[in-house]
Amino acid sequence: ARNGDHCPLGPGRCCRLHTVRASLEDLGWADWVLSPREVQVTMCIGACPSQFRAANMHAQIKTSLHRLKPDTVPAPCCVPASYNPMVLIQKTDTGVSLQTYDDLLAKDCHCI
Amino acid sequence: ARNGDHCPLGPGRCCRLHTVRASLEDLGWADWVLSPREVQVTMCIGACPSQFRAANMHAQIKTSLHRLKPDTVPAPCCVPASYNPMVLIQKTDTGVSLQTYDDLLAKDCHCI
């Protein structure tokens, strides 16, 4: 149940896909990855107001309980709904290999 | 990659399963659910410090970039890794039905 995509907080303030440029050093990968030297990391950032992109029933419950008990129950959180695969050229004991990672780059986002 | 389960912030402070008692009124279900009158809602609450219960590579990246750019990139978030099913007796146009929901109660938690 992907609820409303209208952000009541204003354009770009709610949970959505952002791109953050990061070097191998930024990611702590310099010692085991050769390429790419820089990654366009796609990640999910933004607020999750009531029913915005609610991933499921649990997210809806969380919204209701957060409204009642904000100090106890946090608001839903903006996280990846799916991922795009990515390859890395990584160092091995004997040289290099090309490895695919399926859980590295967010493809789209929801609130949970 | 479920990384370290040791919480550096002290016992119970990091991402884990909590139970929150909620009435049908609390959940906004009173108009369509007959039973149960009260639900022991299991949900994921707590901080996600560096590499604590990191769900995948994306969570590890998020930790690294949050450390570098805390104002831009949020820390990983404590969310359900899986769910327990739950049945609700719900009102229908003609009476009641027993419906199973697979995405209502968190079973265990991770950081993403």
């Epitope: 050769l34 390429s35 695969p85 390859v87 050229i89 290099v96 090309l98 | -």
Partner: antibody
Framework: QVQLQESGPGLVKPSETLSLTCTFS??????????VGWIRQPPGKGLEWIAH???????YFNTALKSRLTISKDTSKNQVSLKLSSVTAADTAVYYC??????????WGQGTLVTVSS | DIQMTQSPSSLSTSVGDRVTITCKAS??????VAWYQQKPGKAPKFLIY???YRYTGVPDRFSGSGSGTDFTFTISSLQPEDFAVYYC?????????FGQGTKVEIK
């Protein structure tokens, strides 16, 4: 496992357009960092890189051939197409496509011989 | 475009011998040189990445070194299946360019 196969006409007349297709399996051209490149080898000669296309649709071409080249991809069909216009006898070669991960060309097709002759 | 010049163009050698091929770039390419092996009628096979890194599954008798403009490819002890043509290629910048090849023949 990764496999690539080139297909083309075999024989092309001078001044016509050569159309080649690379059909692949075992990887996806929607994966960040993945590309498909074309390389050719005239009979008895060395290798010449022609062009490549990336997952994000960025394209790069051999400087000398650039004005005659078109490259495109169909991610859903796992295919990359190359077109070379205004061919001459000098374009006679075995044409290979190769899977690329950044600057690694690790898997190659078996090649297809294209002869330019009237 | 960056030119890659290989030497020698061919060499005759025997099983068990050590073989060294050199490749010179027309400008600094850092360590961005790859090496390929090609047997008659077959597609090239990727051997070495970024001057010195053996690709997955490549036997350790194959090695590479160098940076800047001068690069070396070595087969420490030639095996019967190693008789082939070897190419260097710069992957520093497009257009990617290959050396003209070195044919390793049986003496």
């Amino acid at each position: 496992q990764v496999q690539l196969q080139e297909s083309g006409p075999g024989l092309v007349k001078p001044s016509e357009t050569l159309s080649l297709t690379c059909t692949f399996s075992g990887f996806s051209l929607s994966t960040y960092g993945i590309g498909v490149g074309w390389i050719r080898q005239p009979p008895g000669k060395g290798l010449e890189w022609i062009a490549h296309i990336w997952w994000n649709n960025n394209k790069y071409f051999n400087t000398a051939l650039k004005s005659r080249l078109t490259i495109s991809k169909d991610t859903s069909k796992n295919q990359v197409s190359l077109k070379l216009s205004s061919v001459t006898a000098a374009d006679t070669a075995v044409y290979y496509c190769a899977r690329m991960g950044y600057d690694i060309m690790d898997y190659w097709g078996q090649g297809t011989l294209v002869t330019v002759s009237s | 475009d960056i030119q890659m010049t290989q030497s020698p163009s061919s060499l005759s050698t025997s099983v068990g011998d050590r073989v060294t091929i050199t490749c010179k770039a027309s400008q600094d390419v850092n360590t961005a040189v790859a090496w390929y092996q090609q047997k008659p009628g077959k597609a090239p096979k990727f051997l070495i990445y970024s001057s010195s890194y053996r690709y997955t599954g490549v036997p350790d008798r194959f090695s590479g070194s160098g940076s800047g403009t001068d690069f070396t490819f070595t087969i420490s002890s030639l095996q019967p299946e190693d008789f082939a043509v070897y190419y260097c290629q710069q992957h520093y910048s497009t257009p990617w360019t290959f050396g003209q090849g070195t044919k390793v023949e049986i003496k």
